[in-house]
């Protein structure tokens, strides 16, 4: 650790005196202290002499000697008082900047230690300190306002009693800054904007922070816009607002707008897109297929996405038939707004009944005209089967009618014994009918097909079964010949229960 001569913690001299401070270390040494006039420094190897032959009150302060090569970073210090009867204070700063809840050191250094008993801190023009101002004094360093608050940002003076009268220092401005948690908060409204050429538009960029020191600007396609700024303070926050008003928009106003705000903590930005169009527009679309197939008894939601400007003047769902003149219940129609110009309209169709198959149309209207989007809803049914015995062209024929959607496939089985349903062990013969005759096939209705099985002679101890299946399910009908005549037998359990 370096050693200072004179080896005293503090030295008191009169103005005009010669002061010589010598520092000696093992290696080279350096002096540091408050920037002040008249000092001369002489260095000679491991010693350094700081001297003045005309000390003034401005030289009052703590001078520290360090040894840069010392790994322990040791230092020695001496405090110099230059006691000027006319100048009790040496003020080392015009301004002190601290953050809230930090201690604020106001560097009024007392030039004469004897005056310590009569010192006080006041606000300029003799005003008392604000209530709850907690402060302490050190003749070497000055007044410390503990845990400074934003409201204590004031101009202060240090006061000393000299010969019964108070002598004030020059003033020190204290700036207590709010602790800034991060970059300013931003809002840019609207989030998206569409206008027809010639209409008016407004874009508002605003930023707020607990501290007034922040910048905000609005830029269009990377060009900073010159917009007058409005400032405000409310809810303990500073607000800066930029409002872009366009009386008659044109295509060059379209593009990306960014609101950017920055402070010492960093930068925030948010963007929006402004579209300028030639005329009103109304676009309907759906992510769903417009042709829907749903099993009877199940539910379906039909969704339409609408993009429109200006806003919709009317919209509704309509059932276009073919089964009845019923209309969708309004409570089943639902609208959600994704954003200003995009909406989703949903029609809920729970537990679909046969009479609800058909065309559903969503209609919407704005100044651009009417638009419609139509869904075609076909219901799927499992097959229903019936078998009769008849003669066609003199031949005995089993006639199987199967009705369902999608179109059922038909398979005939012949099995031994009398049974409601042939199982594998009993099957004697199987015939697939790849091309049954289509009896009816109207849109939104079941498809009815007919399959013929010509049987020369009915075997009386056997069963003939017609099976039909499609993607929804299957159905069957067993035909049991009996001596008194044919006997038909549907299965015990009816497979279709809507």
């Amino acid at each position: 650790i370096p050693v200072i001569e004179p080896s005293v913690p503090e030295l008191v001299v009169k103005p005009g005196a010669t002061v010589t401070l010598r520092c000696v270390g093992n290696g080279s040494v350096e002096w540091d202290g408050p920037p002040s006039p008249h000092w001369t420094l002489y260095s000679d190897g491991s010693s350094s002499i700081l001297s003045t032959n005309n000390a003034t009150f401005q030289n009052t302060g703590t001078y520290r000697c360090t040894e840069p090569g010392d790994p322990l970073g040791g230092s020695a210090a001496i405090h110099l008082y230059v006691k000027d009867p006319a100048r009790p204070w040496n003020v080392l700063a015009q301004e002190v900047v601290v953050f809230e809840d930090q201690d604020a050191l106001l560097p009024c250094l007392l030039t004469d230690p004897v005056l310590e008993a009569g010192v006080s801190l006041v606000r300029v023009r003799g005003r008392p300190l604000m209530r709850h101002t907690n402060y302490s004094f050190s003749p070497w360093h000055g007044f410390t306002i503990h845990r400074a608050k934003f409201i204590q940002s004031q101009d202060y003076q240090c006061s000393a009693l000299m010969g019964g009268r108070k002598v004030m220092s020059i003033s020190i401005r204290l700036k207590v800054q709010k602790v800034i948690p991060g970059p300013p908060a931003l809002t840019l409204v609207p989030a998206e904007l569409v206008r027809i050429r010639g209409e008016a538009a407004q874009i508002v960029c605003s930023a707020s922070s607990v501290d007034v020191n922040f910048d905000v600007f609005l830029q269009h396609n990377n060009t900073k816009l010159a917009i007058p700024q409005q400032s405000d303070f409310h809810n303990n926050r500073y607000q800066k607002v930029l409002t872009l008003n366009l009386d008659q928009v044109d295509f060059q106003h379209a593009g990306n707008y960014s609101c950017v705000a920055s402070n010492v903590q960093g930068k925030h930005s948010t963007s929006m897109f402004f579209r300028v169009v030639e005329s009103a527009y109304l676009n309907l679309s759906s992510e769903q297929n417009l042709i829907q197939e749903v099993t009877v008894g199940e539910g379906l939601n039909l969704k339409v996405m609408v993009e429109a400007y200006p806003g919709l003047q009317g919209f509704n769902w309509t059932y276009l038939g073919p089964f009845s003149d019923h209309q969708p219940e309004p409570k089943l129609a639902n609208a959600t707004t994704k954003d200003t110009y995009r909406h989703t309209f949903t029609l809920s169709l729970p537990r679909l009944k046969p009479s609800e198959a058909g065309r559903y149309s969503f209609l919407a209207r704005n100044p651009g005209g009417w638009r419609a989007l139509t869904f075609e809803l076909t219901l799927r049914y499992p097959p229903e089967v019936s078998v009769i015995w008849t003669f066609i062209n003199g031949s005995g024929t089993l006639l199987c009618a199967a009705s369902g959607y999608p179109q059922p496939n038909v398979t005939w089985l012949q099995c031994s014994g009398h049974t409601d349903r042939c199982d594998e062990a009993q099957v004697l013969q199987v015939w697939d009918d790849p091309y049954p005759e289509v009896l009816s096939q109207e849109p939104f209705h079941k498809v009815t097909v007919q399959s013929l099985l010509t049987v020369e002679t009915l075997e009386h101890n056997q069963t003939y079964e017609c099976r039909a299946h499609n993607s929804v399910g299957s159905g069957s009908w067993a035909f049991i010949p009996i001596s008194a005549g044919a006997h038909t037998h549907p299965p015990d359990e009816f497979l279709f229960t809507p």
Partner: antibody, heavy 116, light 110 residues
Framework: QVQLQESGPGLVKPSETLSLTCTVS????????WSWIRQPAGKGLEWIGR???????NNNPSLKSRVTMSVDTSKNQFSLKLSSVTAADTAVYYC??????????WGQGTLVTVSS | QSVLTQPPSASGTPGQRVTLSCSGS????????VNWYQQLPGTAPKLLIY???QRPSGVPDRFSGSKSGTSASLAISGLLSEDEADYYC???????????FGGGTKLTVL
């Protein structure tokens, strides 16, 4: 050995605020005085102001009240803000340690241009 | 307009001795010590002389400073081409409560 590095935007628009930061490495920022000095192209040096680690500042009166300095001992940094800039503030800005009444060492400097 | 006055330019040939001057007033050089800074092309200023005549470690003894009244001078002997630079004088200014600089002298080694 102490090293200083200035950082900040190289271009500032007229009437806006110039903001620079000086990062100190090789020693603690504490217990020293730190200064800002500037040099317009082809001209001499001008002392802007100094800050002590307690937050005490002194400014060159020629810059009036446009100068704000602050210090962040946790980051070993001090900063300069110069408000309402004009083209006359275009210069290379240096940070330096102030020792009694001289400057040593200096940062390498950063050019700030004031232009729209 | 700088507070301290320096000639804008000076020149010398290699090996020659050149002296750069700096004049001020009683508010600066007259009552305070003078410091000199060297600024090589494209670099930051570097402390060359402090307290009128003290050289920081690493500065060759070819450089020497002196002060008389309200003027100061920097002498460079045995001039080298690497000495080609701008040289600035500086001193504490009492009313400013800070340091003032000269306008700088551009030294050319011919």
């Amino acid at each position: 050995q102490v090293q200083l590095q200035e950082s900040g935007p190289g271009l500032v628009k007229p009437s806006e605020t110039l903001s620079l930061t000086c990062t100190v490495s090789g020693d603690s920022i504490s217990n020293y005085y730190w200064s800002w000095i500037r040099q317009p192209a082809g001209k001499g040096l001008e002392w802007i102001g100094r800050i002590y680690t307690s937050g005490s500042t002194n400014n060159n009166p020629s810059l009036k009240s446009r100068v704000t300095m602050s210090v962040d001992t946790s980051k070993n940094q001090f900063s300069l803000k110069l408000s309402s800039v004009t083209a006359a503030d275009t210069a290379v800005y240096y940070c330096a340690r102030e020792r009694i009444n001289w400057f040593d060492p200096w940062g390498q400097g950063t050019l700030v241009t004031v232009s729209s | 307009q700088s507070v301290l006055t320096q000639p804008p330019s000076a020149s010398g040939t290699p090996g020659q001795r050149v002296t750069l001057s700096c004049s001020g007033s009683s508010s600066n050089i007259g009552s305070n010590t003078v410091n000199w800074y060297q600024q090589l092309p494209g670099t930051a200023p570097k402390l060359l002389i402090y307290s009128n005549n003290q050289r920081p470690s690493g500065v060759p003894d070819r450089f020497s400073g002196s002060k008389s009244g309200t003027s100061a001078s920097l002498a460079i002997s045995g001039l080298l081409s690497e000495d080609e630079a701008d040289y600035y004088c500086a001193a504490w200014h009492d009313s400013l409560n800070g340091v003032v600089f000269g306008g700088g002298t551009k030294l050319t080694v011919l």
